[in-house]
């Protein structure tokens, strides 16, 4: 009688013997930042280590009766999600608590400043093997916690945090809403978005991906072998700390960056039911649920992407929006989108050294979205070849020209208010695997990048009817890099990437009165690490 | 996930240096910025975050956290430094009045000024 | 090695109260806590509570709460139940025994038999 | 409150056979579940603690299995000595200690 929970993240391999993965994370620390906890429980005795941190405000009322098993219950749950002997996740790691949070359940800003600052201090002191941060707390937007929290991540820290129990944007919230974080949403045992009284899971682009969040049993503090069941975007983002943990254990040497496309890569796709969250945040919010990797195989082998969403640029006419990768990615194609279709495309620029996607809006426009394809590779060398508009009835076109070199993803801008109005090209012609093709007043960017043993391919789903939506997807053993739209007429709405999936979304055709000859194609660039193929095969 | 123009209220005082006449006062026009945390039941006025700017040395911390207490005196304001940041940011956590914030924000090094606010249990 | 004498059964008038004594030996006293668990003729295991001899503190089974009490004396190595308002239903055979909380209870003595009749 | 429903109440065995003996908690305990013997005119006596690990001096034929809701003791041949009744256990906030109701092994 397994938990749910466990079942739910445990690959169909593990599950023969019930749940009985290897006792991971043993190399890992995991720092938690919380309230008190039972460190006598059973769950967790002999591998929690309470240290002397404690920043906590007084709590609130005059007639507050302090109660120890009230104050350490939040703290202990979450403890024995993480590594319980019975009901943890990973059953290796060890634990170190610090109370931030007084008995309500009540921290600030500064004393989780000063908490992260502790833990910062002491791997300077005393360096050890991988950190996971657990931050099972959120409050508003906060710039100064952001960037603390962006500093650990860089000194080598896995940050995880809940997404925030608020049914709401997750980026209004902090630590969720630093890039750096891995942020974790809460589904439940239908795989829905968990739902806590009148509100709810968070949502949105500043998630990174889901975990079981309600009715998860873990340690009470009732007693020292009671068990309880919670729920909450805490104990979801426990379970992600916990599956970090024996993913590090199995590969010390991963970066945050590593550590998060796998995280996305080994999750359930398209399992939770999206009509819970609010329309306009449904293409925002990733549709994964976290699960452990099928063993503690090495995947250095695969090329893993993720996509990533800017914040909205708002409706002025000149309005941008920015998608980034994270530190140790490359973006190898930029997309955009826009709900009213009226956008000006979007283009690679290169800003503080690194590359970044921007997106454009039109004049009447609502705003749009800029939409990155981050990827993991080796030794990659990336150039943006540009073409300005064509003028001519062939449309725009541009490949990569330099030896080596393959096409990753397909950008388009244009200065015309309206591309509508200017009759679209025709599709690429075939052969030509390394160009891109856009509307004749639009300049067209293509995204070329080397890197060892780097092979692309050029996958198109043209659909002579008017749709909603085209997709296309890549095949097993190739990754998603690019995904655009063939023609880029003022009925797409613009292109995103979902998993593998290159998707392509116009406006409602019943009401723009289009024909037929607006056909619309998804284009995917599709590719593989040959040299990490290899790579691979010499490990094993 | 959140750029750091996110959405949260901030404001900007564009403050230039005056009556104090330090050696080391910010450039002509330099701007340091005050955020708040937009949820207002959940906003700690009175305690606030000076964050000083990435390039800063160490001991610029402690040295800037004087000079805001010294100042402070001379106006007859009652400060706390409660905590020096060393390891993550730099900066100081300190205990005093909204009043002093303008001050605040014209000391050389100082890149923004948060207002503390709670975080909950999830 | 370890042992718990159990003494003070009886037989006892309904209303009446008893005072039952459980004396350990062969490790050291401090380290472990107690319960108290009786069993009434052909039935199943009841427990009354327990004491914490380092600290003193006491739990007990809502049941007996303001009927039972637990004390030790730890200079005798002795645990001591005192039962109140004794009725018929409460004639059973008393057991101590030696536990860590939220472990087993690993070591029980021999049981003394409580009577309750007029 | 757990509540540790055993099963069956009575099981009629040789000497011989083997004997399986189910213990049902209320709600998830994960493996913090102890077995107990008892022969009449004894005291308890610690058989298995934390669901399967055997105490000092019980010999191997006694085995202890399950976790979170469902637990098995199961005698592998049983011994003229083994005719008792067997109780579990766990830990509970109130009250702390929970028995089962017991499962009497007769001889047949």
């Known amino acids: 009688s397994i938990p749910w929970n466990l079942e739910r993240i445990t690959p169909a391999r593990y599950r023969a013997d019930e749940y009985q993965p290897p006792k991971g994370g043993s190399l890992v620390e995991v720092y938690l930042l919380d309230t008190s906890i039972q460190s006598d429980h059973r769950e967790i005795e002999g591998r929690v280590m309470v240290t002397d941190f404690e920043s906590v405000p007084e709590e609130d009322g005059t007639r507050f009766h302090r109660q120890a098993s009230k104050c350490d219950s939040h703290g202990t749950h979450l403890a024995g999600v993480v590594s319980g002997r019975d009901a943890g996740v990973a059953k290796g790691a060890g634990l170190r608590s610090l109370r931030v949070l007084n008995c309500q359940g009540k921290g600030t800003v500064s004393g989780t400043l000063i908490g992260l600052e502790f833990i910062r201090k002491s791997q300077l002191v005393q360096p050890v093997g991988p950190l996971v941060v657990l931050l099972p707390l959120a409050g508003g937007y906060s710039r100064v916690f952001n960037a603390a929290c962006q500093r650990l991540a860089r000194a080598g820290v896995v940050l995880v945090t809940a997404a925030g129990n608020f049914r709401d944007d997750a980026c209004l919230y902090s630590p969720a809403s630093a890039p750096e974080v891995i942020t974790v949403g809460a589904t439940n045992a239908q795989d829905q978005p968990v739902t806590l009284g009148t509100l709810g899971t968070n949502f949105g682009r500043c998630v990174d991906l889901f975990a079981p969040g309600e009715d998860i049993i873990g340690a009470s503090s009732d007693c020292s072998t009671c068990f309880v069941s919670r729920s909450g975007t805490s104990q979801a983002a426990a379970h992600v700390a916990g599956i970090a943990a024996m993913m590090l254990s199995a590969e010390p040497e991963l970066t945050l960056a590593e550590l998060r496309q796998r995280l996305i890569h080994f999750s359930a796709k398209d399992v939770i039911n999206e009509a819970w969250f609010p329309e306009d945040q449904r293409v925002l919010t990733p549709n994964l649920v976290a699960a452990l990797p099928p063993s503690t195989h090495r995947a250095g082998w695969q090329l893993f992407c993720r996509t990533v969403w800017s914040a909205h640029s708002g409706p002025t006419r000149m309005a941008t929006a920015v998608a980034r990768c994270a530190q140790d990615e490359e973006l190898l194609s930029c997309s955009s989108f826009s709900r009213s279709g009226k956008r000006r495309g979007e283009r690679i620029e290169a800003q503080g050294g690194k590359r970044v996607c921007r997106a454009h809006n039109a004049f009447g426009g609502e705003g749009v979205y800029a939409i990155a394809r981050c990827c993991l590779l080796p030794q990659v060398n990336c150039s943006v070849h540009t073409a300005p508009p064509a003028g001519a009835s062939m449309g725009t076109r541009v490949h990569c020209h330099q030896q080596g070199h393959v096409l990753t993803g397909c950008s388009s801008h244009w200065e015309v208010e309206d591309l509508g109005t200017h009759k679209p090209p025709v599709l690429r012609p075939r052969g030509q695997p390394n160009q891109c093709v856009g509307h004749r007043e639009a300049s067209i960017h293509a995204s070329c990048c080397h890197a060892p043993g780097l092979e692309c391919k050029v996958k198109e789903h043209g659909i002579p009817a008017p749709q909603e939506q085209v997709i296309v997807a890549c095949e097993d053993g190739w990754t998603l890099t690019g995904c655009s739209p063939l023609p880029g007429t003022s009925h797409v709405l613009g292109a995103y990437a979902v998993d593998n999936t290159c998707v392509v979304r116009s406006r409602d055709v019943s009401t723009t009165g289009s024909t037929s000859k607006e056909a619309v194609a998804a284009v995917a660039i599709c590719c593989r690490s040959r040299h990490l193929v290899q790579a691979s095969q010499e490990l094993q | 996930q959140e750029d750091e123009d996110g959405d949260y209220e901030e404001l900007v005082l564009a403050l230039r240096s005056e009556e104090d006449g330090l050696a080391d006062a910010p450039e002509h026009g330099a701007t340091a910025t005050f955020h708040r945390c937009a949820k207002d039941p959940w906003r700690l006025p009175g305690t606030y975050v000076v964050v000083l700017k990435e390039e800063t040395h160490r001991s610029q911390s402690e040295r800037t956290a004087r000079r805001l207490q010294a100042q402070a005196a001379r106006r007859g304001y009652l400060t706390k430094i409660l905590h020096v940041f060393h390891h993550l940011l730099p900066g100081f956590l300190v205990k005093m009045s909204g009043d002093l914030l303008e001050l605040a924000l014209k000391l050389p090094h100082v890149d923004y000024i948060e207002e503390d606010s709670s975080v909950f249990a999830q | 090695q370890v042992q718990l004498l159990e003494s003070g059964g009886g037989l006892v008038q309904p209303g009446g109260s008893l005072r039952l004594s459980c004396k350990a030996s062969?490790?050291?006293?401090?380290?472990?806590?107690f319960s108290w668990v009786r069993q009434a003729p052909g039935k199943g295991l009841e427990w009354i509570g327990y004491i914490d001899p380092g600290s003193g503190g006491t739990k007990y089974n809502q049941k007996f709460q303001g009927k039972a009490t637990i004390s030790r004396d730890n200079s005798k190595n002795t645990l001591y139940l005192q039962m109140n308002s004794l009725r018929a239903e409460d004639t059973a055979v008393y057991y101590c025994a030696r536990q860590r909380v939220g472990y087993s209870l690993d070591y029980w003595g021999q049981g003394t038999l409580v009577t309750v009749s007029s | 409150e757990i509540v540790l429903t055993q099963s069956p109440a009575t099981l009629s065995l040789s000497p011989g056979e083997r004997a399986t003996i189910t213990c049902r908690a209320s709600q998830y305990v994960g493996s913090y579940l102890n077995w107990y013997q008892q022969k009449p005119g004894q005291a308890p006596r610690l058989l298995i603690y934390d669901a399967s690990n055997r105490a000092t001096g019980i010999p191997a034929r006694f085995s202890g299995s399950g976790s979170g809701t469902d637990f098995t003791l199961t005698i592998s041949s049983l011994e003229p000595e083994d005719f008792a009744v067997y109780y579990c256990?766990?830990?509970?906030?109130?009250?702390?200690?929970?028995f089962g109701g017991g499962t009497k092994v007769e001889i047949k």
């Open positions: 256990q766990v830990w509970d906030s109130s009250p702390p200690v929970v």
């Open positions: 062969g490790y050291t006293f401090s380290s472990y806590s």
